[in-house]
């Protein structure tokens, strides 16, 4: 029998040499085909995300498809041979007879493959979305936990203030918030989470112990501690949180705030509408600046905070969200931004020269024994300053957002709700400039930093959503804010790096800035961080404040700085609106900068702990930050300014009447900003119920070893 069996040939009967190919038709046709190489399709190889099942299905389909193609190829060959009159054997004939079937199967398999590939992609997308969602949820949980830690640190820290203690014992409405016993418990607990430096232990170890206490408190464990349990302590702390005591306006400025009221009185009470370009609000120039502490927390009167959404969030919530944002954004080279005095009375001087004179006058006043000039001023030209911290575009003259008033204005009732660019600075509260500073819907007619005037009660609870929404400054948010000149909107400069921390200012990612490439010099040297990440961060701060952590692989442990509430002030410029402010690599101010005080993002390094009594000499060191080369810099050098006396610079040496060696002051380890003198160190200096001398640093050493995420 012609073995028609296996060949499927068709052709010429028995005569003639076997088809040379040995394609024994039938089989080939049968498609049995040797094992086709398994799925070569890209889809099948997407493995990682794809479920195993989908992978296998695609593999099978792929193999089948290739077998069918191979089979069809043979059938075509057989038919061709048949057409030439060549005899096919039975197998080949059988195969040829199935030509249509094979063709149909092939089409079907292709369709199936397409469907499964699409399905596979959908699955992948779904898995990615799910993973992302889970990641966001995890991040959110972490942020909440961090927020709680910061709140806790703030509260514990504040409890060192006698006035606060008294208030809490007396209660706001006569109802005591805490008993003496509870205060004592918190004092005891404070010693655990802010331990004296034990040189027999490694710092790491010491804070590890402290962090365990904090953790157990957060968990509300039933474990005993300080003669009670963490659970009880947690309830006590929560009671304090819920009392909103710290959200209302209390004039506890962590130290001296001597004639605040008088000082800020001259501030214009009502905002000048945008149309009136230069209401000459004056900087109240006080010679007591040195002895004054600045309250960074409560800047803006409620009326001035015209956010799109009016829901209110407990200011704690917001501030910590912001702190978290900034922490998460801790750049690898977290520039040592330090809190600036934030009570600003916007002044729009008509003449740049006048403004410059005013600045110089202020500087002169600040030349007292404390050498008050902030490094941040100097750092503006300092290469060590993080390139990400760049100055903002010159302000539109119409923006009443002038220089910070370097005095301690009354804190009145502006709540601590995260003002742009600032996490509230409690007397020694952790202040981290908000990376996600956004122009929370500030209307154009209102300066970003309002003079702290009347005691307008700021809504206590701005919904976190709202903050988050404004934090994200998505394009939908730009309605109110876009009326501000681009420069006036707080910015998180995340151009090339993920190091916006501490550099509050204009959110370049906000829609209004999308087209303003000139605002920042994208070529400024920055450490090689995941640039694409940061560039993508347009919508990063969304309703769930889900910043991606990927932009900074190592979180610089800036808890120190956080404690310092590193805040920066948007130096409001009154340059012409069209001046695009190009920041060069060395952070020089552009020539157009008409202002005398061109400090957009000037970190002030607030030495919180000093008020506690002791010097915080080591602060700077502990707070080393990553310099431009991503190398860890000790705090001292990191904060040393270098004057670049460029003509553009708002500060040339000549501007200061007395030459001073700023670097010397920097070596103290903390910026001169709030170096307290021999004046009263504020209630915080008091021993706070503990025996022995006052703790030098009640400000919770920030758990330096604890990574945020």
């Amino acid at each position: 029998m012609p073995s028609a069996t296996s060949h499927s040939g068709s052709g010429s009967k028995s005569s003639g040499p076997p088809p040379p190919s040995g394609s024994s038709g039938s089989e080939a046709a049968a498609g049995a085909g040797a094992a086709a190489p398994a799925s070569q399709h890209p889809a099948t190889g997407t493995g990682a995300v794809q479920t195993e099942a989908m992978k296998q299905i695609l593999g099978v389909i792929d193999k089948k498809l290739r077998n069918l193609e191979k089979k069809k190829g043979k059938l075509d060959d057989y038919q061709e041979r048949m057409n030439k009159g060549e005899r096919l054997n039975q197998d080949q004939l059988d195969a040829v007879s199935k030509y249509q079937e094979v063709t149909n199967n092939l089409e079907f398999a292709k369709e199936l493959q397409r469907s499964f590939m699409a399905l596979s992609q959908d699955i992948q997308k779904t898995i990615k979305k799910t993973a992302r969602r889970e990641q966001l949820m995890r991040e959110e949980a972490e942020q909440k936990r961090l927020k709680t830690v910061l709140e806790l640190q703030y509260v514990l820290d504040k409890l060192g203030d006698d006035e606060v203690r008294t208030d809490l014992k007396q209660g706001l409405n006569g109802v005591p918030i805490l008993s003496e016993e509870e205060l004592s418990l918190l004092d005891e607990f404070y010693k655990l989470v802010d331990p004296e430096r034990d040189m027999s232990l490694r710092l790491n170890e010491q804070y590890e112990h402290a962090s365990i206490h904090l953790w157990d408190l957060l968990e509300g464990k039933e474990k005993p501690v300080c003669g009670t349990t963490y659970k009880v302590l947690k309830e006590i702390v929560e009671r304090v949180f819920q009392s909103n005591y710290f959200d209302s306006t209390h004039n506890h400025q962590n130290g001296l705030c001597e004639e605040e009221e008088a000082a800020s009185a001259p501030a214009v009470e009502d905002q000048v509408p945008e149309a009136e370009p230069e209401p000459a609000e004056e900087y109240t120039e006080q010679s007591e600046v040195e002895s004054t502490e600045y309250v960074n927390r409560q800047f803006m009167a409620e009326t001035q905070f015209t956010s799109g959404e009016k829901e209110q969030v407990d200011e704690w919530t917001v501030e910590t969200v912001e702190v978290v944002n900034s922490l998460q954004q801790q750049p690898q080279a977290a520039s040592p931004s330090v809190p600036e005095p934030h009570s600003l009375t916007p002044v729009a001087q008509a003449d740049p020269l006048v403004r410059r004179q005013r600045v110089q006058d202020l500087m002169a006043q600040m030349q007292g024994p404390y050498n008050f000039i902030q490094d941040s001023m100097l750092d503006f030209e300092n290469q060590t300053l993080d390139p990400a911290i760049v100055s903002a575009q010159p302000m539109n003259p119409t923006q009443n957002m002038d220089m910070p008033q370097l005095v301690c204005p009354p804190v009145h009732s502006e709540s601590r709700l995260a003002q742009p660019n600032q996490v509230p600075v409690q007397p020694e509260a952790t202040q981290v400039p908000l990376v996600s500073s956004t122009s929370e819907g500030y209307t154009a007619s209102q300066p970003l930093y309002q003079p702290s005037h009347a005691t307008e009660q700021r809504p206590q609870k701005e919904p976190i959503d709202q903050i988050q929404a404004t934090i994200s400054l998505n394009t939908d948010q730009t309605t109110a804010s876009s009326s501000l000149p681009a420069a006036s909107q707080p910015q998180v400069f995340q151009a090339g790096t993920s190091k916006p921390l501490h550099s509050s200012g204009i959110n370049v990612n906000a829609a209004p800035f999308q087209s303003m490439q000139t605002v920042f010099n994208m070529n400024a040297p920055v450490p090689p961080v995941n640039e694409p990440e940061t560039l993508k961060q347009q919508n990063q701060y969304q309703a769930s404040y889900n910043q991606s952590f990927s932009s900074q692989p190592h979180q610089v442990e800036q808890t120190e700085l956080q404690q310092e509430q590193l805040q920066t002030v948007v130096g409001t410029y009154h340059g012409s609106p069209d001046q695009s402010h190009q920041v060069t690599g060395n952070h020089q101010q552009p020539p157009q900068q008409n202002t005398g005080f061109p400090r957009s993002n000037q970190p002030y390094y607030n030495s919180r702990g000093v008020s506690r009594g002791g010097s915080r000499g080591a602060r700077g060191l502990m707070n080393g930050y990553r310099g431009p080369a991503n190398g860890f810099r000790g705090g001292y050098d990191g904060y040393r300014p270098s004057f670049s006396n460029t003509p553009n610079s708002g500060y040339t040496q000549s501007q200061f009447s007395a030459p001073r060696d700023y670097s010397g002051y920097q070596r103290d380890g903390y910026q001169q900003n709030f170096k307290r003198g021999s004046g009263q160190s504020g209630p915080r200096g008091a021993p706070r119920g503990r025996g022995g001398p006052p703790r030098p640093n009640r400000g919770m050493p920030q758990m330096n070893t604890q990574q945020v995420n």
Epitope: M1, P2, S6, H7
Partner: antibody
Framework: SLEESGGDLVKPGASLTLTCTAS?????????MSWVRQAPGKGLEWIAY???????TAYANWAKGRFTISKASSTTVTLQMTSLTAADTATYFC??????WGPGTLVTVSS | DVVMTQTPASVEAAVGGTVTIKCQAS??????LAWYQQKPGQPPKRLIY???NLDSGVPSRFKGSGSGTDFTITISDLECADAATYYC??????????????FGGGTEVVVK
């Protein structure tokens, strides 16, 4: 299926015609119908095939002249055997191509 | 006609073992070769066609290979049911030359 018939006990020198009947299909153009035999305890031996499409036939060298394969109808193929000898004693199978086989029919040549 | 020579005539192997049977054609037949399994009292059952293609329903333990004049079938993971006689057959049909569809002599596989 296929079924062979016509097997019998015959004397040497006799002739015999075997028939292969198809059920469930008819012999259309694309089939080779073959005959194969197997002597008791021996191996398979191909005899001949016919290509139904054009009636072309092929035979094993040893079968030429004594065996003839033909298509009798759309469902039957026959094998005519002449001058049988004892060596022709075997089970005869018909097959379509080489895939489908009948159960075989026994031909015994004996005196 | 082409002559097919099959070796060995008989082979014994244990369950789970492997058996290889060879078939040699007297002239090149390309890949026109089929392998059959036959058990006593039954007609042959084709296992492989075109030298290496498995018929449907045949376990993949059966593997055919070769082309031209030398062919082999390998049965791995032997099972008791594999005990049978195996044949090779030339399945070439060509108008120019008559190859004939000769069978090999067969190989008996005994499974212990």
């Amino acid at each position: 299926s296929l079924e062979e018939s016509g097997g019998d006990l015959v004397k040497p020198g006799a002739s015999l015609t075997l028939t292969c009947t198809a059920s469930g299909f008819s012999f259309s153009g694309s089939y080779y119908m073959s005959w194969v035999r197997q002597a008791p305890g021996k191996g398979l031996e191909w005899i001949a095939y016919i290509y139904i499409g054009d009636g072309v036939t092929a035979y094993a060298n040893w079968a030429k002249g004594r065996f003839t394969i033909s298509k009798a109808s759309s469902t039957t193929v026959t094998l005519q055997m002449t001058s049988l000898t004892a060596a022709d004693t075997a089970t005869y199978f018909c097959a379509r191509g080489n895939k489908l086989w009948g159960p075989g029919t026994l031909v015994t040549v004996s005196s | 006609d082409v002559v097919m020579t099959q070796t060995p005539a008989s082979v014994e192997a244990a369950v789970g073992g492997t058996v290889t049977i060879k078939c040699q054609a007297s002239q090149s037949i390309s890949s026109y070769l089929a392998w059959y399994q036959q058990k006593p009292g039954q007609p042959p059952k084709r296992l492989i066609y075109d030298a290496s293609n498995l018929d449907s329903g045949v376990p993949s333990r059966f593997k055919g290979s070769g082309s031209g004049t030398d062919f082999t079938i390998t049965i791995s993971d032997l099972e008791c049911a594999d005990a049978a006689t195996y044949y090779c057959q030339c399945t070439a049909v060509s108008s120019a030359t008559i190859y004939g569809n000769a069978f090999g002599g067969g190989t008996e596989v005994v499974v212990k």
